[in-house]
């Protein structure tokens, strides 16, 4: 999905559907700021580097974030 190149909110749509962590290249959490009043979560997929915007209010996305951070903490020494 294309992302805005402005200093406003980045996402065009936000999805409640979690992505498969194995398909994930990178997960960015952009905190709310003076430019965008919302937290935005951008998932970069391994396939073609596609970016997907995820809904931070969604239960499924919150669970995904927990799973990813748990996986990261396992990997860090």
């Amino acid at each position: 999905v294309p992302l805005s190149r402005t200093v406003r909110c980045t996402c065009i749509s936000i999805s409640n559907q979690p992505v498969n962590p194995r398909s994930l290249e990178k997960l960015e959490i952009i905190p709310a700021s003076q430019f965008c009043p919302r937290v935005e979560i951008i998932a970069t997929m391994k396939k073609k580097g596609e970016k997907r915007c995820l809904n931070p209010e969604s239960k499924a996305i919150k669970n995904l974030l927990k799973a990813v951070s748990k996986e990261r903490s396992k990997r860090s020494p």
């Epitope: 999905v1 805005s4 406003r8 909110c9 065009i12 749509s13 999805s15 409640n16 965008c36 997907r52």
Partner: antibody
Amino acid sequence: QVQLVESGGGVAHSGKSLRLSCAASGFTFSNYGMHWVRQAPGKGLEWLAVISYDGSNRYYADSVKGRFTISRDNSNNTLNLQMSSLRAEDTALYYCAKDAGGPLDYWGRGTLVTVSS
Amino acid sequence: SYVLTQPPSVSVAPGQMARITCGGNNIGDKSVQWYQQRPGQAPLLVVYDDSDRPSGIPERFSGSYSRNTATLTISRVEAGDEADYYCQVWDSSSDHPEVVFGGGTKLTVL
């Protein structure tokens, strides 16, 4: 189920204005970008504009930039297209469509705009 | 701006396979969607993200891509598949993202 219903089409004189609306239901409207796409009689699809889920970003095709304005009202689940300085070549069936992060996954049935000179 | 090129028409006999191509510079780097539009109807999404199918779309519809061409394949073509087919991508190469459609391909079932 997802429903998109366009309205506001009709006959307009060249140089005049027209406002199209799209009533959305069956999904969380405030989570999704929305598009306007048109199709001239016997021709292909032409993308016109998109507005982000919260209305903070709007992008337009060069053919309508400066003449058309896309807007939304998330409290009423409504998408709008304000068209001004209409030309004969704007005659088309106008569709609203829901963005799904790449694809346009649901479309309305369209509203016909005829511009007479 | 980005251009997608489709053949104006493709003809196929019932039960045979139809292939509709969509050419674009390095289209393999982009996510491609395909829409079916029957006469007098709104477009219907049949393939998204190159090769995924929305629920309710038969397995006969599939998508694939190479570096400069995306392909919609319809196997065991039926009379009801006769329609116009459009490919679509997002182009983010300019200063603002925009949606680009191919010119459309009319599929005729002989």
